[in-house]
């Protein structure tokens, strides 16, 4: 067994804000140190945590894909919110991609709902 330094963790990352865990957990915006003695703040714009936790790493901020716009930037307590660009929408079945909204309704149907970042246009049959 190799004998090493005692608790070097306590001296790590001095640039990050620290506090003490409560019942072994750290508040949103923080992660726990390796020796469970301190809560270390996540790095703004890089990572985050949303709940009380004992994470060794904060969660990495999402980067919006091309075809998406950033609605809310990442903070230490909230992930980035990305939205499909105008004219595209995200389907529940395939949330990883933004699909083009239809430009119009088939013959015999009328548009009742416009394209949104969450849904395609909605068409209903014309009343005869």
């Amino acid at each position: 067994i190799t004998r090493q330094s005692l608790d070097p963790q306590r001296r790590a990352a001095p640039q990050q804000k620290r506090s003490s865990p409560t019942e072994g957990l750290c508040p949103p915006g923080h992660h726990i140190s390796e020796d469970s003695r301190e809560c270390i703040s996540c790095k703004y714009g890089q990572d985050y945590s949303t709940h009380w936790n004992d994470f060794l790493f904060c969660l990495r901020c999402t980067k919006c894909d091309s075809g998406e716009v950033e609605v809310n930037s990442c903070t230490t307590t909230r992930n980035t919110v990305c939205q499909c660009e105008e004219g595209t929408f995200r389907e529940e079945d395939s949330p990883e991609i933004c699909r083009k909204c239809r430009t119009g309704c088939p013959r015999g149907m009328v548009k009742v709902k416009d394209c949104t970042p969450w849904s395609d246009i909605e068409c209903v049959h014309k009343e005869s």
């Epitope: 067994i1 190799t2 004998r3 090493q4 330094s5 005692l6 070097p8 963790q9 001296r11 790590a12 990352a13 001095p14 640039q15 072994g24 726990i32 390796e34 020796d35 469970s36 003695r37 936790n53 004992d54 994470f55 060794l56 790493f57 990495r60």
Partner: antibody, heavy 117, light 108 residues
Framework: EVQLLESGGGLVQPGGSLRLSCAAS????????MSWVRQAPGKGLEWVSA????????YYADSVKGRFTISRDNSKNTLYLQMNSLRAEDTAVYYC??????????WGQGTLVTVSS | EIVLTQSPGTLSLSPGERATLSCRAS???????LAWYQQKPGQAPRLLIY???SRATGIPDRFSGSGSGTDFTLTISRLEPEDFAVYYC?????????FGQGTKVEIK
């Protein structure tokens, strides 16, 4: 004095399972995050998995995700690595280590896992 | 993942000489989460340096670490016979934790 003692290694067939244990002493085990690091014969070091002091958070290398499970029993001062669906490329000496991100400041002597038919 | 590239792969030196080992990261790593280890054949690795420049307990002062961002260095000021071994750098800034491939310091 900090001591880490691994056990549970051995010869296993591809697709088989093995459970490694690491008995810890000389420090407040429940306070510290712990890791498993492996070394294939003649190769370098590869981090495998880590767990927080309470056991509430676990982390894995992509190469073992979904096949290996790290856990700990703080009442027994013991760290575990359950290895399922073993492959030839998992053949290595497995080290239990104290720490995760800042450094691995104490290491066990290692236990050899050989996956072969 | 952050890839750590160590150079040279092998360093052939004589006792008493200075050894300079390099560890280059594929993206910036926090100095707080950069460590160096020594490993001899048949033995577990041994922590030398943590936080890029802090010596672990019991490590002789001929070992020193420096660097920041993507470039880190381990220096052994005067090689002793027991220093001939393989040296690894390791980063813990982001998950997954990664090691360099190692630098072997051998007797010339």
């Amino acid at each position: 004095e900090v001591q880490l003692l691994e056990s549970g290694g051995g010869l296993v067939q591809p697709g088989g399972s093995l459970r490694l244990s690491c008995a810890a002493s000389g420090f407040t085990f429940s306070s510290y995050a712990m890791s498993w690091v492996r070394q294939a014969p003649g190769k370098g070091l590869e981090w495998v998995s880590a767990i927080s002091g309470s056991g509430g958070s676990t982390y894995y290398a992509d190469s073992v995700k979904g096949r290996f499970t790290i856990s700990r029993d703080n009442s027994k001062n013991t760290l575990y690595l359950q290895m399922n669906s073993l492959r030839a490329e998992d053949t290595a000496v497995y080290y239990c280590a104290k720490g995760v991100r800042v450094s691995f400041d104490y290491w066990g002597q290692g236990t050899l896992v050989t996956v072969s038919s | 993942e952050i890839v750590l590239t160590q150079s040279p792969g092998t360093l052939s030196l004589s006792p008493g000489e200075r050894a300079t080992l390099s560890c280059r990261a594929s993206q910036s790593v926090s100095s707080s989460y950069l460590a160096w280890y020594q490993q001899k054949p048949g033995q577990a690795p041994r922590l030398l340096i943590y936080g890029a420049s802090s010596r672990a307990t019991g490590i002789p002062d001929r070992f020193s670490g420096s660097g920041s961002g993507t470039d880190f260095t381990l220096t052994i000021s005067r090689l002793e016979p027991e220093d001939f071994a393989v040296y690894y750098c390791q980063q813990g800034t982001t998950h997954p934790i990664t090691f360099g491939q190692g630098t072997k310091v051998e007797i010339k």
